[in-house]
Amino acid sequence: QRLPRMQEDSPLGGGSSGEDDPLGEEDLPSEEDSPREEDPPGEEDLPGEEDLPGEEDLPEVKPKSEEEGSLKLEDLPTVEAPGDPQEPQNNAHRDKEGDDQSHWRYGGDPPWPRVSPACAGRFQSPVDIRPQLAAFCPALRPLELLGFQLPPLPELRLRNNGHSVQLTLPPGLEMALGPGREYRALQLHLHWGAAGRPGSEHTVEGHRFPAEIHVVHLSTAFARVDEALGRPGGLAVLAAFLEEGPEENSAYEQLLSRLEEIAEEGSETQVPGLDISALLPSDFSRYFQYEGSLTTPPCAQGVIWTVFNQTVMLSAKQLHTLSDTLWGPGDSRLQLNFRATQPLNGRVIEASFPAGVDSSPRAAEPVQLNSCLAAGD
């Protein structure tokens, strides 16, 4: 199979093979027509919703018979519903007082727009990236990171928050998307799947990667997140896909080796400071960028997403540790913690490199590239 146009950049390598999505996000119904985040990851599309062959918003699954088959609801991790009477065994139980709609979850009720109306917005994340439709923008310069190489002290808080594993970052990590577009890193977290089921949030031509890292930043124009929510450019996220490689990733091992300590929902531990930039791809010059939203409630829009073209390699054992160690609400494993891809609704994804120029023999017909919106910057 042909590699999607995630370039095989050394040293960390590129994308792995994936199916072509026969329909672009632009053709999908708007978020208001069919908000999809209430669907469990992997749930089959409802009639009339998308019903497309090759739709890969959903995790790949090998049915027990090893034959091709559709994913059934019983294959999904069970999550204790609000109000379930049983007391979980792992001491991470449902809050009984204030059991309102704010306790959202992946793959079940309540529907996210009921939790936060912004989740039904038109410019949501994540999205499927189709490099052939990306607009090459020479104005998108290499990302600049300063202060990301942290000393061992002070230690950092690593927490299982029931939705992900989150590392809170100290002050002083500066990131620039370009001149005058300066940010401060706040925290990083991961999204993953389950055994044999990929769990990245963004996809490339319908291909879902094993996992994805998000480093969340606040614009220097704002003092606090609550001021920046929903403001264009107020928040920026650096995202990178995690793939399986032959060797252990020593940077990630500094975090993954501590996951056992925070297996229970709500638990936290202190980890020595580390080189945060080592968790990201080495090539800061090749990336995709678009404006979207937070991928969890309240789903606030105006978030600048920068998705690296280069991927990060972890060993099979490390990816297994990531997806098989933590517990979420009730007695459910913390797995498949990704939101389905959302319609672009006319948005154009920009690329800092000519991603649409396909040198492979498959590119028989001419490709119509979108124009670069940032050309006048």
Epitope: R159, H163, L218, E227, P298, P329
Partner: nanobody
Framework: QVQLVESGGGLVQPGGSLRLSCSAS???????????VAWYRQAPGKGLELVSV???????KYSDSVKGRFTISRDNSKNTLYLQMNSLRAEDTAVYYC????????WGQGTLVTVSS
């Protein structure tokens, strides 16, 4: 601006009870209900210790030293976090801080709890 204001601290005898409250104001309506919220404490001459947390997913967790005696709860309609403390001991004496964690940490100014006869 999000402001977290703790209240309910004071002097109590061993075996007694207190209820701490942490009220969030300002833009907190945007974030409180989506945040993990927690109580930390700092005893004299000691480091910061996590007492209890309610995660954004709704689960609760307690440190071993308070399990069975303390109960954490939240009321998102009031943007308020609570900590019911029963069977208090001298070693519970500390400044208790409210923490709201939504992409970044928000902290209260702390309320002093003194357990002494």
């Amino acid at each position: 601006q999000v402001q977290l204001v703790e209240s309910g601290g004071g002097l109590v005898q061993p075996g007694g009870s207190l209820r701490l409250s942490c009220s969030a104001s300002g833009n907190s309506a945007n974030i409180f209900s989506f945040a993990s919220v927690a109580w930390y404490r700092q005893a004299p001459g000691k480091g910061l210790e996590l007492v209890s947390v309610i995660t954004s997913a709704g689960g609760t967790k307690y440190s071993d030293s308070v399990k069975g005696r303390f109960t954490i709860s939240r009321d998102n309609s009031k943007n308020t976090l609570y900590l019911q403390m029963n069977s208090l001991r001298a070693e519970d004496t500390a400044v208790y801080y409210c923490n709201v964690d939504y992409l970044q940490d928000y902290w209260g100014q702390g309320t002093l709890v003194t357990v002494s006869s």
